[in-house]
Interface confidence: low
């Protein structure tokens, strides 16, 4: 799903205080609900009818430093005698979610957010068919 | 998939460095790669044998304000005759994903990560079936 | 009524680049996956390349791998094939075709059911 | 990758015969992406068939195709002098195409 574009609003103060200096903000340390956790069932990525492997990407400058990013494994779907159905499509399911990006020049550290296109599994469609009349 | 704990050390300076004063950190203004975009499949939340419903929750506090939830719609999945087959499961895939909450008093304005577990989609398992030895 | 009208045929010499454009009308363009078929002289039809509705996904023939680029642009309903060190045996009429079927992330072919006119490469010295 | 090969590579009949074409696939292919089209001389390809059996849009109901797995036909019930031509078989994948089969004037 999509993430809105910031506007710059967001992150401003009411317009009756003073701007925020130096075009950056103050970021509490610590994260809201860290705690909470997935919890799907068991290997889908295998049980699924449009089953898909995992891929990580590691970046020690970005929170979360491991990005999985999924990938369906068959253009079509299995069926229930375990073989590849054309005629049905394994099709991505994205995400749109943030990272922070830390960046430092010696003791200055500062950090931004980032936004990243995350496919997070596979589902199995009905192809839309439609004939020229 | 999982976001691991921030064990305090991706925020901190480096060791040689004076601390971070107050517990707070500097985050730059704007996002990177802002104008990336999701470019999934069509209606694939109707097209699919494992069919979902999104469900928007709004926060004016939040960013991104806007997050969308799905459900799957059934508990078993949508075969070829556009039947539900209870022989089969349809499954959220979820994920955990960052958001910022922003914090004021007054002219005091302050931000922090939360994770926040969203569901993405569904997808068509095969049950696990468990037999009592 | 749905058409696709080709430009940017020629004759070329070997090494070098031509770019063949493809215009569509009559149909909604970003639904569908498109593709590009040519005919040597005298012999049968070959896919040459294929690109999904949203260029998510493009696909090659083997024998233009690493030479020919397809592209798209869907607010100009345009479709694109960048031809670069072009070689002898790819001189044949080429033709841009729609897929029949709306797919998800295709750039293979189930049928293509609207052909362009086609267009002449000729490669020679 | 599956190859599809045509035969015969030329039939020679007359008006009102039926002709019928194959279309063999080295490996099994998913019936719902097989598709024949007919080609005449500086026309570009139509597509007459999709779907291993349905017709396209347009296309006289003297022509049907039938089979699955590897082995496929096209079908003239009755040749019309528009008919003489050169078809081809097509399977979803990246060499789609068969060598052809023309059809000519006995």
């Known amino acids: 799903r999509k993430i809105p574009k910031v506007g710059h609003t967001f992150f401003q103060k009411p317009e009756s205080c003073p701007p925020v200096p130096g075009g950056s903000m103050k970021l509490d340390i610590g994260i809201i609900n860290e705690n909470q956790r997935v919890s799907m069932s068991r290997n889908i990525e295998s049980r699924s009818t449009s089953p898909w492997n995992y891929t990580v990407t590691w970046d020690p400058n970005r929170y979360p430093s491991e990005v999985v990013q999924a990938q369906c494994r068959n253009l079509g779907c299995i069926n229930a005698q375990g073989k590849e159905d054309i005629s049905m499509n394994s099709v991505p399911i994205q995400q749109e979610t943030l990272v922070v990006r830390r960046k430092h020049q010696g003791c200055s550290v500062s950090f931004q957010l980032e936004k990243v296109l995350v496919t997070v599994g596979c589902t199995c469609v009905t192809p839309v068919i439609h004939h020229v009349q | 998939r999982k976001i691991p704990k921030v064990g305090h050390t991706f925020f901190q300076k480096p060791e040689s460095c004076p601390p971070v004063p107050g517990g707070s950190m500097k985050l730059d203004i704007g996002i990177i790669n802002e104008n990336q975009r999701v470019s999934m499949s069509r209606n694939i939340e109707s097209r699919s044998t494992s069919p979902w419903n999104y469900t928007v929750t709004w926060d004016p506090n939040r960013y991104p304000s806007e997050v969308v939830q799905a459900q799957c719609r059934n508990l078993g999945c949508i075969n070829a005759q556009g039947k539900e087959d209870i022989s089969m499961n349809s499954v959220p895939i979820q994920q955990e994903t960052l958001v910022v909450r922003r914090k004021h008093q007054g002219c005091s304005v302050s931000f922090q990560l939360e994770k926040v577990l969203v569901t993405v989609g569904c997808t068509c398992v095969t049950p696990v079936i468990h037999h009592v030895q | 009524q749905v058409q696709l009208v080709q430009s940017g045929g020629g004759l070329v010499q070997p090494g070098r680049s031509l770019r063949l454009s493809c215009a569509a009308s009559?149909?909604?363009?970003?639904?569908?996956?498109m593709h590009w078929v040519r005919q040597a002289p005298g012999k049968g039809l070959e896919w040459v390349s294929g690109?999904?509705?949203?260029?998510?996904?493009?696909g090659y023939a083997d024998s233009v791998k690493g030479r020919f680029t397809i592209s798209r642009d869907n607010a100009k309903n345009s479709l694109y094939l960048q031809m670069n060190s072009l070689r002898a045996e790819d001189t044949a009429l080429y033709y841009c075709?729609?897929?029949?079927?709306?797919?998800?992330?295709?750039?293979?072919?189930?049928?293509?059911?609207?052909w362009g006119q086609g267009t002449t490469v000729t490669v020679s010295s | 990758e599956i190859v599809l090969t045509q035969s015969p590579g030329t039939l020679s009949l007359s008006p009102g015969e039926r002709a019928t074409l194959s279309c063999r696939a080295s490996q099994s292919v998913s019936s719902s992406y097989l598709a024949w089209y007919q080609q005449k001389p500086g026309q570009a390809p139509r597509l007459l068939i999709y779907g291993a059996s349905s017709r396209a849009t347009g296309i006289p109901d003297r022509f049907s195709g039938s089979g699955s797995g590897t082995d496929f036909t096209l079908t003239i019930s009755r040749l019309e002098p528009e008919d003489f031509a050169v078809y081809y078989c097509?399977?979803?994948?990246?060499?789609?195409f068969g060598g052809g089969t023309k059809v000519e004037i006995k």
């Open positions: 009559g149909f909604t363009f970003d639904d569908y996956a």
């Open positions: 075709a729609k897929e029949l079927y709306i797919s998800d992330w295709d750039s293979y072919s189930y049928g293509m059911d609207v």
């Open positions: 097509q399977q979803y994948g990246s060499s789609p």
């Open positions: 690109i999904s509705w949203n260029s998510g996904t493009i």
